[in-house]
Structure formats: C-alpha cells, structure tokens
Amino acid sequence: QDPWAAEPRAACGPSSCYALFPRRRTFLEAWRACRELGGDLATPRTPEEAQRVDSLVGAGPASRLLWIGLQRQARQCQLQRPLRGFTWTTGDQDTAFTNWAQPASGGPCPAQRCVALEASGEHRWLEGSCTLAVDGYLCQFGFEGACPALQDEAGQAGPAVYTTPFHLVSTEFEWLPFGSVAAVQCQAGRGASLLCVKQPEGGVGWSRAGPLCLGTGCSPDNGGCEHECVEEVDGHVSCRCTEGFRLAADGRSCEDPCAQAPCEQQCEPGGPQGYSCHCRLGFRPAEDDPHRCVDTDECQIAGVCQQMCVNYVGGFECYCSEGHELEADGISCSPAGAMGAQASQDLGDELLDDGEDEEDEDEAWKAFNGGWTEMPGILWMEPTQPPDFALAYRPSFPEDREPQIPYPEPTWPPPLSAPRVPYHSSVLSVTRPVVVSATHPTLPSAHQPPVIPATHPALSRDHQIPVIAANYPDLPSAYQPGILSVSHSAQPPAHQPPMISTKYPELFPAHQSPMFPDTRVAGTQTTTHLPGIPPNHAPLVTTLGAQLPPQAPDALVLRTQATQLPIIPTAQPSLTTTSRSPVSPAHQISVPAATQPAALPTLLPSQSPTNQTSPISPTHPHSKAPQIPREDGPSPKLALWLPSPAPTAAPTALGEAGLAEHSQRDDRWL
C-alpha cells in the first residue's frame, strides 16, 4: 500500500503522537488544522523525536513536502544559531536537533519563511514560502499517558480498530493516547468497545480488562464470567451474578452495588438503584437526601426520661436532679439511697472496663458543668464556662458518629480535629467520658480515643485531618486544591481563632482525591505533607478570616489572596544547545518578585538538577506558556463550610442542678 495514500496516519509513544496528514495546505492552514485537533505542528527537537518522525514519514517521494512547526519572520536571520532565527510554533527556539538541507547562507532574509520536511531520503528541512500549499503536514499531540495496544485474542474477528482523540482511525498503533477508543469485533458476533481512561490508582489504562471475546460456551474459563455462566440457545454465553450482586458494565464481572453506594450508614443490595440505604437506630434518613442519616432527637419523645434528658448524636441520656439516683433501667429516678443505685453503679462498672480510676472520672465529670457540643472540624469555640481540664472525650464512638467534647480552654492549642475513633467495642452503650488533665495524661484504652496533649504527638491515620473540600471557580472539580497543610501557634490568644494557612503545596495529581498520608510533628507545629500535583495547577494561599463570629462557629470563611506561586516542576534534563532561552512551564504564570510574599519562596524546595541550564524548564519539552485569554475580576472568595453540629436539646437544668447521676443511652437499647 502506498504510504502516501490519502489517509492520515500516526505513530504514538507513551506521551506523544506524531500524525501525518497528506493534505495540501499552506503553513497557516496546517497550523490551524493541528490546533483544531488539539495539537500543534510537529516540533522534532531531539534525535529520538526525529527518529519517530522518520519512521512515520517513511520513504516517501522526493516531490512530497510536509510542514513542521518552524517559522521565521522577515529580517530575523540568526545564522549562527541552530534554528537560524526560526522559532517553533510553541514559541521558543530550544532544540537539540536540526536537519537543515543546506548550510546557512548569508542572505538578507527579506521575507517570512517556514520549514517543510522532505518526505524522501533523510527527511531534510527546507525553508520556503509559508503561503505555498505543500503536500501535507505533521502534527504533534502531547498527552498525560497512553494505553498499550490490545493483544489479539483467539476469538477476535480481526485486529482492534483504534480511534484517537485527534480523529485518526487505524489498526496500526503501539500506544493509544488517553481518550482513545478501541473497537474489537469478535467472531461470535458481539464486539467490545474500550476507552483509554484515567485509572483510580493513577496512570491510564483500558476501561475493561480482557478477555474481550468470550469463547464458545461456558466450558473454557467459565465463559469469562465471574459468577454464573449461562449458555444461550444461539451458542453465545451470558453472565449472571449471585443474589446481592449486579452485572458490571463489562458484562462479565459482578459488583456489589453497596461497595459504590453513597450510603452514610447502612446499605442493602436491591431496589431501583441496585441498593437502598438504611439508618441505624437513633438515626433517620435525611429529608433532603435519603443517603444521609440525621440524628433522632429522642428527648422530644414524651416520657423518654423520667426527669431530665440530653440528646446526643445517635443516642440520649437521662439525668436525675440532686437527691435522686438513676435506676437500673436508665430512665427512672428514685430518691438517693434507694435500691436502684447499686444496680446503676454496677452497670457503669461493667461498661467502663478500662482500668481507669473511676473516682477521678466522677470528680471531673461533676466538676464540669459547661455544655457539650459537637466539634466538626478545626474550630475554636468560645466556652460557656471554661473547664478545669484540658480535653475530654467520650470513649468508644461508633465510626460514623462525630464525638462531642467539652469546650477546651482557649489558651490551649487546638486539637487538629475531633478524631474519628474506630468502633472497637461490642458494648452497645456509650459510657461516661474519660477526662484527662494536662498534668496527668492517661493512656487511651481500647475503648477510648486518644487525647491530644499540648505537645501534639503525631496523629494516627484514623485521627488525621478530614479533607475540607473547596469550590474553586477557575478549576474543574478534579483539580480543586484542598487545604494542604495546617499550622498553628502553640498558644493562640483567647477568644481568637488561629490562622490557618496553606503552605506551598506539592500539588495533587489530576483526578486524585487529596489525602493526608503523612503527618509529621515538630514541637507544637503540625504540618500535613501531601503527594504532588502536576505543576499546571497553581496553589492558593489562603488565610483564615481574623475573627470568627461567636454566634456562627461552624463557618470557616477563607479568603484567597490569589497569590500565584512560581512553580519549579520536577525537572527534566534540559536540552543543551546554544539557542537556549528560558521557557516558562506550560500553563503557569510566574509572579514578579515584587508581588510575592517575602516568606513564601523560602518554602520552595529546589528540585532542579545541578546540570540544568535554564532556571525554569518546561514540563513537557515542547511546552511554552500559551497566551490564554484571562478574565480579570476580583480575587475569588473561597468559602469553606464545615458541617454545623446537629441541634441538641440543651440541658438547661444542668446549670442549676448538679449532675448527681446520669446515664448515657444508645438508641439501640430502645
């Protein structure tokens, strides 16, 4: 077959494709054609790239010429430079390769010139009139990753037909760029269509794993089915799943609908969506979203406690007034000294099996007559009455419940978050809080969450800062920055929230949720270190508003200072030529030194190798900051809303009456 047939063709590697379009076009038309497909005219800057171009072009006729991405304006001759004054269409003159047909001649360069590549022989570079419609053009497409060509299977009717994002259709690919589609026809009649997609674990891969063409019947490899294989009358096989599972999109594997279901608490297979959500006792489905569960306020139920009731998330507590004791049923109250008191104390002992000094706990419990409240995130709240101890937690919260803690003293360093404690205990109730003072720290037991003392020991994974999602208007959701590290001073002033600032982040990889895998502690400063983000997403420097209104402690409003930090990407070896000029990284804007906060650049670790000749090298060797239209406007406000604590029935009576006896009830007792 004539390689110069009318059909375009391409050669792809793991990170870029070259495509040959045998269409007669002027330079400008060719440039536009490449841009419309999401690429650029080819810029073969290295011998390796030139080799790929050579293999794509092949041994064409000498009469054929192909545009590449080099042009020179009139009177811009620089004959001593490798590119002779020509500039790549990406805007720079960096190259480690040239292939000029003739040595430079000392002409005056009176007119604009563009470069075409000879289709024959050594594919030499020729300069000529940009308005000449040559025989074709070479485009180049860069991408984040590629999928390897599919292996042929026994049951295939022919080779896979690939369609690239730049609309090339061929069976002759070694690599397929992200976004390509593979169509496989099977001998059995049915076909499969696969997409080269981003994988959850990173990288790219085909949307389906092989085998794509099932054998005849169920006998070989269960027909490719994960669960049950059924042989149809026409000889085809179909797959079925056992109860509680549903057939996945690939038609062969089975998936648990609850594995992906967004149920907050409990999930059961079945129903119109393939699953249905349920709430545990003490909770009910939220009216606006049946996937979520909200606390049931049992204290609103008449007669739930004989005397006083305090609701908390997932349960409630009954209390008795001074001179009364809670009976064994946890509801009734009897005058002090009556028979029920011992039973109640026994129950407390049984539930509190943790080796702590119970007298101390009782004393601390009684001493505290401030209110309980939920602490949903990194917040300071003004205490109604400061306790005489540092932090107190209720032990053994089931994992989906937010613990409630007494208001901490404002002079204490704040906890990073109210930790989510894994649910270890088989005991159904929630017992009295373990109170730990700063002078006498107590080791947590299996039923108690760890207490964060003043020296901030490193948090375990279960207790790390929850990710705070932020809507950043200029970025797609996959690229929204999270709050990347939090630092606070050891002693924030009383009644003032600490500053929360994001240090310079190593930005998240696209399409990956930000996680907090590595929290390190130095003194009283805690910094959470995060995995890296590609350098085409500038970080936000955020500062917390100076004062949070006491009446709205659940709202964190972050202002973005819109300070774009210069990014030094993970360096690639620079191309060493005499024609070097600094190139900005793709899609990045460096901030002039004058506008940068003085302290910020010191946070940037230098990642450049010692042999780097340019201060900033491009992320992709062919990239230059394009002139992207900018919509100027005010700096975007970034509001982070933390979930409000569920309204609790405030124990107003507790202020006047001491808590002589109390009980904590889990609604599963009801």
Epitope: R24, P61, A111, S129
Partner: antibody, heavy 124, light 108 residues
Framework: QVQLVQSGPEVMKPGASVKMSCKAS????????IHWVRQAPGKRLEWMGY????????TYNQKFKGRVTITVDKSASTAYMELNSLTSEDTAVYYC?????????????????WGQGTLVTVSS | DIQLTQSPSFMSASVGDRVTITCRAS??????VAWYQQKPGQAPKLLIY???NRYTGVPSRFSGSGSGTEFTLTISSLQSEDFATYYC??????????FGQGTKLEIK
C-alpha cells in the same frame, strides 16, 4: 543532465483529440511532478494540470472541464497529455515542465526544466 | 483565481541600462513567485524562485524582491542576450499556477 523531450507538432481537426508525450531523462522520473502549460499565439502562459509520477496523482485546471487527461508510463519515464474536443482556440504550443522540489536548501514549486514544446494547430 | 498584472507590457532599453519590471498580485501570495525569461521559439527558463532567490546558473545581474502582492525583477546592467519576454508566475494556491501577461523587453 536533465532533459524533457516532447513529441513533434500536430495538426488536428476541430472536435478531434490530440495526445502528446514528454520523455524525461537525467533524473529519477518518479521524484518530480510534471506540469503541462500551454501558450496560445500572443497570449500568456496557461497552466493545464499536473501529474505526480510517484502515485499518478493528478490535478487539472477547471477551465478545461474534463477535456484534458494526463498520464505517465513510469517504465518509459514518459508523461502524456491528451486534449479532447479540440477547437481553434486550442491552437497553441504545449509545454511539459518539471516542478522543482528544492534549490540550495529552499523548497519551491516553480518549474525548473521545460520541454521544447509541441505545437498543436487546430484547423478545419 | 489570483490574477497577476505585469507592468510595463513593453519596454525599450539599451545595453548597460538598469531595468525594473513589476508584477502585482490580486491577493497576498507571500513569496511564492517566480520569474521566467522566454526567447522567441524557446521554452521559458527559470530565473528567480521564491520571489528573491536566484536559480542556479543565472547571472548575478538578475535579482528579485517583494512579498505579498508587489514583486519586482531587476536587471542591474542590461546585456544583449537579455532582450526577451519576462513572465512572473505565482504558485501560492498550488497547483493553480497563474502567469502574468508578460513584459517584452526590446532593444532601444
């Protein structure tokens, strides 16, 4: 040296067809496009069409409305041009010309070598 | 179609004279312009390609300039063998070549 040698003069009747030849030598025939250009007495040069001997790719001037056909015989390194439905307006000298590919590091589509021309006279 | 207009159509000059012939294009053709010399009974010969590049073997007294729509052929010192007809040609909308009507240069 490069040479394009054309066939001899033709006298044709109106309505007839004429086919002339252009034999190339001194270069690789399939590496260069061949154009046909005519020049009527006292008129400017007029491009008629071309053929790429490498793949027989052809393009014609719309003015000739399908009356012209250009072919090649690669084995003989010869290009042919046939013009049908002749009228007196077609009386002219017909040239074959080779399109240059590059000169001294420049690509260019000017015509660097020409045949001596074939005079076609259309007369009743 | 792109039209090429040469001026003058006829001109007389003497040996040693400096001669300039102009070619105007009806639209921008960049530098895709060539100049040919044709003597009676002969085929055209290429003098200048890409508006300003002298073809191999062409004497240095011939030069070309211009880009866009205006082009000139200059003979710096006319020789007796230079009396001929000169044609400009554009090939920017290749393969639709068009030629100017020609400038006949005669001995004064």
């Amino acid at each position: 040296q490069v040479q394009l040698v054309q066939s001899g003069p033709e006298v044709m009747k109106p309505g007839a067809s004429v086919k002339m030849s252009c034999k190339a030598s001194g270069y690789t025939f399939t590496d260069y496009v061949i154009h046909w250009v005519r020049q009527a007495p006292g008129k400017r040069l007029e491009w008629m069409g071309y053929i790429n001997p490498y793949d027989d790719d052809t393009t014609y001037n719309q003015k000739f409305k399908g009356r012209v056909t250009i072919t090649v015989d690669k084995s003989a390194s010869t290009a042919y041009m046939e013009l049908n439905s002749l009228t007196s307006e077609d009386t002219a000298v017909y040239y074959c010309a080779r399109r240059g590919n590059s000169y001294d590091g420049y690509f260019d589509y000017s015509m660097d070598y020409w045949g001596q021309g074939t005079l076609v006279t259309v007369s009743s | 179609d792109i039209q090429l207009t040469q001026s003058p159509s006829f001109m007389s000059a003497s040996v040693g004279d400096r001669v300039t012939i102009t070619c105007r294009a009806s639209q921008n053709v960049g530098t895709a312009v060539a100049w040919y010399q044709q003597k009676p009974g002969q085929a055209p010969k290429l003098l200048i390609y890409s508006a300003s590049n002298r073809y191999t073997g062409v004497p240095s007294r011939f030069s070309g300039s211009g880009s866009g729509t205006e082009f000139t052929l200059t003979i710096s010192s006319l020789q007796s063998e230079d009396f001929a007809t000169y044609y400009c040609q554009q090939y920017t909308n290749y393969p639709m070549y068009t030629f100017g009507q020609g400038t006949k240069l005669e001995i004064k």
